[in-house]
């Protein structure tokens, strides 16, 4: 988790002087509770936006937006803590809005936004906005949280972001797999425009089961420039095991931008349809 272009962060708006600060996610009001605390945020919304860095890179960001309730507690609102928790790693990043002037009621509802948390493809986040100071122990909670899932690199809009392109999202191998005679598979795919090697990972399964009955790895050396965007054809020999008929072919590229952590593409060959076999007729008939 990180912030995009940290030096450009602003939270001031007409009628409010405000500064954005790094936060340890442990506001001082936890340790030194105040008697009077503000109410919780209203209408917290999290949206996926896309933002360019000053270097021109494009990143997915969490756009966080919320409003204030129209009650007198805004007189005691000193700021807000924004927290983003990545659920699969438990990594948390926080920033603090510090109000440098007192809020006053005005003719329209106070609204705040922040769009600088960079999020990763195919990750789920819990976004929390805590009004400050935080409540006293056993006080009413004054935060709001939302869970938010970011699409993966297969998503059309995500595909062109820098993290996705770095992991090879623009490469479409258009894999085809056909079953040949004599227990062989022909795998064909389009090479990318980079002199890098590939690996074909073959995993075979019985018809209705998910534990593998055969595994094989095939190395494809780096193509020459004249072979870029051409089709590569590989014939794989299968183990002659009856019923080991469902084959998953996965192609792993080793592009320079993602090394051994590039997006993999796969194709599956299903078992052939079995005709319904009639009950065998016994070749003798019992007489009793």
């Amino acid at each position: 988790l990180r912030l995009l272009d940290h030096r450009a962060l602003v939270c001031s708006q007409p009628g409010l002087n405000c500064t954005v600060k790094n936060s340890t996610c442990l506001d001082d009001s936890w340790i030194h509770p105040r008697n009077l605390t503000p109410s919780s945020p209203k209408d917290l919304q999290i949206q996926l936006h896309f933002a360019h860095t000053q270097q021109g890179d494009l990143f997915p960001v969490a756009h966080i937006e919320w409003t204030l309730q129209t009650d007198a507690s805004i007189l005691y609102l000193e700021g807000a803590e924004l927290s983003v928790l990545q659920l699969n790693t438990n990594e948390r990043l926080c920033v603090r809005f510090e109000f440098l002037s007192k809020l006053r009621h005005h003719h329209r509802r106070w609204r705040f936004t922040f769009s600088h948390f960079v999020v990763d493809p195919d990750q789920e986040y819990e976004v929390t906005v805590h009004h400050l100071p935080k409540p006293i122990p056993d006080g009413d909670p004054n935060h709001q949280s939302k869970n938010f899932l970011v699409p993966d690199c297969e998503h059309a809009r995500m595909k062109v972001t820098t993290p996705c392109m770095s992991s090879g999202s623009l490469w479409d191998p258009n894999i085809t797999v056909e079953t040949l005679e004599a227990h062989q598979l022909r795998v064909s795919f389009t090479l990318w425009n980079e002199s890098t090697h590939y690996q074909i990972l073959l995993t075979s399964f019985p018809h209705m089961e998910n534990h593998s009955c055969f595994e094989h790895m095939h190395h494809i050396p780096a193509p020459r420039p004249e072979e870029f965007h051409q089709r590569s054809n590989v014939t794989l020999t299968l183990r002659n095991l009856k019923g080991c008929c469902r084959h998953q072919v996965q192609i792993q590229p080793f592009f320079s931008s993602c090394l051994n952590d590039c997006l993999r593409h796969s194709a599956t060959v299903s078992c052939p349809e079995m005709p319904d076999t009639p009950e065998p007729i016994p070749d003798y008939m019992p007489l009793w």
Partner: nanobody
Framework: QVQLVESGGGLVRPGRSLRLSCTAS????????MHWVRQAPGKGLEWVSG????????DYADSVKGRFTISRDNANNSLYLQMNSLRSEDTALYYC????????????????????WGQGTMVTVSS
Amino acid sequence: QVQLVESGGGLVRPGRSLRLSCTASGFTFDDYAMHWVRQAPGKGLEWVSGISWNGGAMDYADSVKGRFTISRDNANNSLYLQMNSLRSEDTALYYCIKEKSLGYCRGGSCSDAFDIWGQGTMVTVSS
């Protein structure tokens, strides 16, 4: 223009099944997460289920978990809700909803993340 059209509602006996469909037009369907929300007669809106852009993630309200299944067919711009073991308390007007942004707001506290609603299809569960 952007449009969502629900169908498949009707009168059904308790314990039976029904499949709701929603056809989308006017936007890139496979960019967005979709949800089903319902409103029982005289009651407020209740979120029922949601699904991510590619169907990789699905969520359900506790009241329908294990009985309802959400799915989508991006090739045909369609969203579905398979409703099994229907109960009288499932009687409601069911709405198909598109999310505002490209992410997927998970769980039931997402009403402010929705922007396009269909006109609804009525499901009545009665013996």
